[in-house]
Amino acid sequence: MMTGTIETTGNISAKKGGSVILQCHLSSTMAQVTQVNWEQHDHSLLAIRNAELGWHIYPAFKDRVAPGPGLGLTLQSLTMNDTGEYFCTYHTYPDGTYRGRIFLEVLESSVAEHSARFQIP
């Protein structure tokens, strides 16, 4: 029985040209995380973190994706085209597969600074 839940950073925004950390966290299960797949909105794989085999960053993203922190992923040199959904797929043993969703909005620098100011309580 799958008892775990995926917590994600949810909807996030970042500046064009900047970087952002995509992070998911699996909780409420004792299952072992054996692999995490990071996918873009069009189902193309950005990176895989296998518990035993390590990281693989796909060639199309090698220049702009850095592994980590942890099982997360750092997207760099953001462009407007990076706006969209990102999915973390946690393959676990023995539970099976958990999936989380993050929506990233890449904003023009001035807009991002402006919206960030309004988010400060």
Partner: antibody, heavy 125, light 107 residues
Framework: QVQLQESGPGLVKPSETLSLTCTVS??????????LAWIRQPPGKGLEWIGS???????YYNPSLESRVTISVDTSKNQFSLKLSSVTAADTAVYYC?????????????????WGQGTMVTVSS | EIVMTQSPATLSVSPGERATLSCRAS??????LAWYQQKPGQAPRLLIY???TRATGIPARFSGSGSGTEFTLTISSLQSEDFAVYYC?????????FGGGTKVEIK
């Protein structure tokens, strides 16, 4: 190029333990970044994954066989082995050892890249 | 566990014709799908990984497509050496599971 060779008895009596060994040549298990797997194929039927082990000793088993299966690795001999207890006629099959994930670092996929030629094991009294 | 279902069980095709084999997963496996070819008395060999990428040394007449739950292996022009059984397999997650196979036979 890594090659695999299965060895073990071709005939096992019901209720006994089936024991097979896979010898890896052309590469060292202790430094290899891949899974070592056992897969079987009953006569005239399809493929069934039995289980996999990593060099560190992490094991993963098919839930339908888990209570009867033990996979272990001996890095000093460059071998890994399969033990299947309490066998019945339903365990009669060709048993393959395989390497999974050998190309993960380069290509990002985990699949059974390299296979042994297989060994037929018959369970009969 | 993820159940892999292949269809048809047997496909009768004439040499030189196109063969289309299907594989369906009981839940999404993204593009984590491999195809294997097995000839009588031989071990399977990896044809396609990542749903669509040919393994080393595999001829261009073999192509894979699909994502999620629906996958296809196409052999564009069947050669005599292509008559065999073909299996799909998902990985990850554990347990690894294979489809039941499609036998491609000479019509």
């Amino acid at each position: 190029q890594v090659q695999l060779q299965e060895s073990g008895p071709g005939l096992v009596k019901p209720s006994e333990t089936l024991s097979l060994t896979c010898t890896v040549s052309g590469g060292s298990i202790s430094s290899g970044s891949y899974y070592l797997a056992w897969i079987r194929q009953p006569p005239g039927k399809g493929l069934e994954w039995i289980g996999s082990i990593f060099r560190s000793g992490s094991t993963y088993y098919n839930p339908s066989l888990e209570s009867r299966v033990t996979i272990s690795v001996d890095t000093s001999k460059n071998q890994f082995s399969l033990k299947l207890s309490s066998v019945t006629a339903a365990d009669t099959a060709v048993y393959y050892c395989a390497i999974e994930g050998a190309n993960f670092k380069d290509f990002g996929y985990v699949a059974f890249d390299i296979w042994g030629q297989g060994t037929m094991v018959t369970v009969s009294s | 566990e993820i159940v892999m279902t292949q269809s048809p069980a047997t496909l009768s095709v004439s040499p030189g014709e196109r063969a289309t084999l299907s594989c369906r997963a009981s839940q999404s496996v993204s593009s984590n799908l491999a195809w294997y070819q097995q000839k009588p008395g031989q071990a399977p060999r990896l044809l396609i990984y990542g749903a669509s990428t040919r393994a080393t040394g595999i001829p261009a007449r073999f192509s894979g497509s699909g994502s999620g739950t629906e996958f296809t292996l196409t052999i564009s022009s069947l050669q005599s050496e292509d008559f065999a059984v073909y299996y799909c397999q998902q990985s990850p997650p554990w347990p690894r599971t294979f489809g039941g196979g499609t036998k491609v036979e000479i019509k």
